[in-house]
Interface confidence: low
């Protein structure tokens, strides 16, 4: 059966031969070439068969011709457009790295029928025009010689001669567009205008000050220097900047305590309340402090428990009436005190110091009784006349047949004197055994005490 149509053609193919007939008999072959930029493995052939054109090898087709790698350029990169493989129709567009620029205007290569068009683009370093030093200044930190061009990234720094300061930027660098990053600075004479002092007024009367000249000022009532009362003219202006701020107090540091309210700044007149903890107490009466022009009054402090007015038994503080209003007092305070007649301090003196410690007053018993040992009739008198201090106990030895009352053998110096009173009393006894001597008193079955010849009998059964 004939084919009544021309052989079909893809847009990548070119039909070879002459095809001017209206019909084509069965078996007619149409042979195709690939268009420029395309290729196939062997010819593409269609055959007329049973009235229609069929491909002899359906898998065979014209595909884009590959070009290979377009080539890298130093100091630059390329990107592909129109595709993502190196084949016909794709374009490699080159861009230079920062600080480099294309030599020439063509920045691409195209994969064409005969391979890549154009040469590989070249990237050269960006250059900036030479720069000169400003008047009354010089260029530093440049490796370049004068009047030479600078490459991208290179920097020049300017310094001004003494008495001059830079107006503008002290450094500029060669940018990636071939221009300097900043305007060249000027060197201008250093001077400062008389400054306005907010909440203060000048003492110095000049209008313009030269470098290192000093400006003095004072602050209005209720204000204080932010830093100090004068400023120096420097190339960066007044240092420190003259300024007066409302008198204020720093946030108080209260070890072992907290305060409220918390403020960034405490102005004169502001009041805080503070609490102490962990066994600590406000060091002064009350627990408030006020910010004044001289700081916190009273100073907020937490101390260990203060000492109340000391109650000195058998003694007292010197200048008692003068001191009493100042109590309670803090740990560490001490006062001189005296002891009454018949009493002395633990150091053996009639006066000493009493100290406020974290455990209270020290010494705890400031005045101790002095006891002088009396003459013992019917006793041994090795201690006669000797002084003993409150709390001291001593042995008493009576002559045979005598003893302390109630068979005691020691006397103790107490707050009110000796206890019991040292005296040797006649003892009569009947023995349970045949022994004799002072020790037998304590073994006796029955003891009779003769006190001043009276008839009172105390029977002690052991």
């Amino acid at each position: 059966e004939d084919c009544n149509e021309l052989p079909p053609r893809r847009n990548t193919e070119i039909l070879t031969g002459s095809w001017s007939d209206q019909t084509y008999p069965e078996g007619t072959q149409a042979i195709y070439k690939c268009r420029p930029g395309y290729r196939s493995l062997g010819n593409v052939i269609m055959v007329c068969r049973k009235g229609e054109w069929v491909a002899l090898n359906p898998l065979r087709k014209c595909q884009k011709r590959p070009c290979g790698h377009p080539g890298d350029t130093p100091f630059g990169t390329f990107t592909l457009t129109g595709g993502n493989v190196f084949e016909y129709g794709v374009k490699a567009v080159y861009t230079c790295n920062e600080g480099y620029q294309l030599l020439g205007e063509i920045n691409y290569r195209e994969c064409d029928t005969d391979g890549w068009t154009n040469d590989i683009p070249i990237c050269e370093v960006v250059k900036c025009l030479p720069v000169t030093a400003p008047e009354n200044g010089k260029i530093v930190s440049s490796a370049m010689e004068p009047d030479r061009e600078y490459h991208f990234g290179q920097a020049v720094r300017f310094v001004c001669n003494s008495g001059y300061k830079i107006e503008g930027d002290e450094e500029m660098h060669c940018s990636d567009d071939g221009f300097w990053s900043k305007e060249k600075p000027k060197c201008v004479e250093i001077s400062c205008k008389s400054p306005d002092v907010i909440n203060g007024s000048p003492i110095s009367q000049k209008i313009i000050y030269k470098e290192n000249e000093r400006f003095q000022y004072k602050c209005n009532m209720g204000y204080e220097y932010s830093e100090r009362g004068d400023a120096v003219c420097t190339e960066s202006g007044w240092r420190p900047l003259p300024s007066c701020e409302e008198k204020s107090c720093d946030n108080p540091y209260i070890p072992n305590g907290d305060y409220s309210p918390l403020r960034i700044k405490h102005r004169t007149g502001d009041e805080i309340t503070y609490q102490c903890r962990n066994g600590f107490y406000p060091a002064t009466r009350g627990n408030t402090a006020k910010c004044t022009s001289t700081g916190w009054i009273p100073a907020p402090r937490c101390t260990l428990k203060p000492c109340d007015y000391p109650d000195i038994k058998h003694g007292g503080l010197y200048h008692e009436n003068m001191r009493r209003p100042y109590f309670p007092v803090a740990v560490g305070k001490y006062y001189s005190y005296y002891c009454d007649e018949h009493f002395e301090t633990p150091s053996g003196s009639y006066w000493d110091h009493i100290h406020c410690t974290q455990d209270g007053w020290s010494p705890a018993v400031p005045c101790l009784r002095k006891c002088y040992f009396p003459y013992l009739e019917n006793g041994y008198n090795q201690n006669h006349g000797r002084k003993f201090v409150q709390g001291k106990s001593i042995d008493v030895a009576c002559h045979p047949g005598y003893a302390l009352p109630k068979a005691q053998t020691t006397v103790t110096c107490m707050e009110n004197g000796w206890s019991p009173t040292p005296r040797c009393i006649r003892v009569s006894f009947t023995l349970g055994g045949g022994g004799s001597g002072l020790n037998d008193i304590f073994e006796a079955q029955k003891i009779e005490w003769h006190e001043g010849g009276g008839g009172s009998h105390h029977h002690h059964h052991h």
Partner: antibody, heavy 124, light 113 residues
Framework: QVQLQQSGPGLVKPSQTLSLTCAIS??????????WNWIRQSPSRGLEWLGK?????????YYALSVKSRITINPDTSKNQFSLHLNSVTPEDTAVYYC??????????????WGHGTMVTVSS | DIVMTQSPDSLAVSLGERATINCKSS????????????LAWYQQKPGQPPKLLIY???TRESGVPDRFSGSGSGTDFTLTISSLQAEDVAVYYC?????????FGQGTKLEIK
Amino acid sequence: QVQLQQSGPGLVKPSQTLSLTCAISGDSVSSNSAAWNWIRQSPSRGLEWLGKTYYRSKWYNYYALSVKSRITINPDTSKNQFSLHLNSVTPEDTAVYYCARDGDYYLPSPFDLWGHGTMVTVSS
Amino acid sequence: DIVMTQSPDSLAVSLGERATINCKSSQSVLYSSNNKNYLAWYQQKPGQPPKLLIYWASTRESGVPDRFSGSGSGTDFTLTISSLQAEDVAVYYCQQYYSTPYTFGQGTKLEIK
């Protein structure tokens, strides 16, 4: 056993003074290891601490800022009790009022003992 | 003032299950000098005053069952009841006693599911 016994009126007229007393048994108001507090509770404000008094060589008082201008807490050592006086009351002061102890020498500490509470209504 | 915020406002838990209540303070209640958190937990049942359960954030008050425990430090704290009992139905409050005015959370109502 330590107990706190509250007393005082349950109804106070606006602008008058609210006065409550808390009697302490088993402890001392001038104890060196406790502080004595007043706290109130209402649906609108929840639990609200009002202030406290305690003795450490002398008497200390702390009040909440919200009531500072109107409140006084007084210890009474002779009766071993402490009292709350809140003047210029408004219906906003309607609440259950509690006295409470924080019972630790190392102030501050939590409230370990509470009174039974007194419902106070401010109304004319 | 230090603001105490509890979550959730109410909680329903089955008997024997774990209940967890959170409390957040607007600033730290940890005192560095003694490394203690000044935070307490209370339980309040209807018609009764609050009862102290936990102090120093994690120390159980004497007589409080060991199913109650507290944890956390600085600004974030938790009260845990490990196995809920019927008698634990109450409102629970956290409270800071770090600085005056002492402040309480708004409370968490605990119910049985």
